[in-house]
């Protein structure tokens, strides 16, 4: 029986050109998390695997950074980044838990959940 629940950042908005942190939190289960996937519609953005660490999809490498924690940071946002994002927790023995976040990228507004980056 799957007892866990996923809490997400919900519906969020951010400014074009800015950054946003996507976060999900799995709770109320003792199941062991083995992998967390981040997906945008049907595209894989990133994976955090228990044995292999983080893998960022090559097409997103310049604009996606892992963390904080099991979250994901999207940088240099464009209007095309507007849409649904999913965190998929693979657990044993429960199975899969999925959380949904809707991101709206605005032409000009105050960015929420902004992240500060330093890229050498």
């Amino acid at each position: 029986m799957m007892t866990g629940t996923i809490e997400t950042t919900g519906n969020i908005s951010a400014e074009k050109g800015g950054s946003i942190i996507l976060q999900c939190h799995l709770s109320s289960t003792t199941a062991q998390v083995t992998q967390v996937n981040w997906e945008q519609q049907d595209q894989l953005l990133a994976i955090c695997n228990a044995d292999l660490g983080w893998h960022i999809s090559p097409s997103f490498k310049d604009r996606v950074a892992p963390g904080p924690g099991l979250g994901l940071t999207l940088q240099s946002l464009t209007v095309n980044d507007t849409g649904e994002y999913f965190c998929i927790y693979h657990t044993y023995p429960d199975g899969t838990y999925t959380g949904r976040i809707f991101l709206e990228v605005l032409e000009s507004s105050v960015a929420e959940h902004g992240a500060r980056f330093q890229i050498p």
């Epitope: 992998q35 967390v36 228990a50 660490g53 983080w54 893998h55 950074a65 963390g67 890229i119």
Partner: antibody, heavy 117, light 107 residues
Framework: QVQLQQPGSELVRPGASVKLSCKAS????????MHWVKQRHGQGLEWIGN????????NYDEKFKNKGTLTVDTSSNTAYMHLSSLTSDDSAVYYC??????????WGQGTTLTVSS | DIVLTQSPATLSVTPGDSVSLSCRAS??????LHWFQQKSLESPRLLIN???QSISGIPSRFRGSGSGTDFTLSINNLETEDFGMYFC?????????FGGGTKLEIK
């Protein structure tokens, strides 16, 4: 098996700089955050900052922004922390720690930095 | 920055006792809270991650609970090897922060 190897100690003069190292083995170095943590004698743990070797992205605690610089050498699987303008306040044990799916799951043994004339 | 406050600062107990250590966050960190044990002259060791997830190789007498701002590390039937320092840490947002620690000492 995963290992993070740090030199046991470093002795430096006040005003000088030092580059602490953390050599990683047993895992894919570029796929995990590497963090640096400071612990003064008998005190608590202070998070200095982190670096993602796969991209070079760094984050720092504001307190350490003008004190430490984090770098990596992916060819040798080694993380570095450069500390500048050293004072006695910088005397401490400095740990490197790996963060993956299970948070800070592996730590180095720590380098004891002594700043003394 | 998120401040983590641990209490009590020191706890004097007898082997065989059960104890609860508290960690309180200055704002909600959901379940991004981890517990570490540190013995004298050793590196910290991860005990519990994400508030309540058990770690391979850690005895089952260590249990974590809580969410949001209030978290607890419970240790049942204390053994002599359990004495030392305990720290909580949040990874909900950068900068990551640690609590000031609780010293568990033998009465």
């Amino acid at each position: 098996q995963v290992q993070l190897q740090q030199p046991g100690s470093e002795l430096v003069r006040p005003g000088a700089s030092v580059k602490l190292s953390c050599k990683a083995s047993g895992y894919t170095f570029t796929s995990y955050w590497m963090h640096w943590v400071k612990q003064r004698h008998g005190q608590g743990l202070e998070w200095i900052g982190n670096i993602f070797p796969g991209s070079g992205i760094t984050n720092y605690d504001e307190k350490f922004k003008n004190k430490g610089t984090l770098t990596v050498d992916t060819s040798s699987n080694t993380a570095y922390m450069h500390l500048s303008s050293l004072t006695s306040d910088d005397s401490a044990v400095y740990y490197c720690a790996r963060e993956g799916l299970y948070a800070f799951d592996y730590w180095g043994q720590g380098t004891t930095l002594t700043v003394s004339s | 920055d998120i401040v983590l406050t641990q209490s009590p600062a020191t706890l004097s107990v007898t082997p065989g006792d059960s104890v609860s250590l508290s960690c309180r966050a200055s704002q909600s960190i959901r379940n991004s809270l981890h517990w570490f044990q540190q013995k004298s002259l050793e590196s910290p060791r991860l005990l519990i991650n994400y508030a309540s997830q058990s770690i391979s190789g850690i005895p089952s007498r260590f249990r974590g609970s809580g969410s949001g701002t209030d978290f607890t590390l419970s240790i049942n039937n204390l053994e002599t090897e359990d004495f030392g320092m305990y720290f909580c840490q949040q990874t909900n947002s950068w900068p990551y922060t640690f609590g000031g620690g609780t010293k568990l000492e033998i009465k």
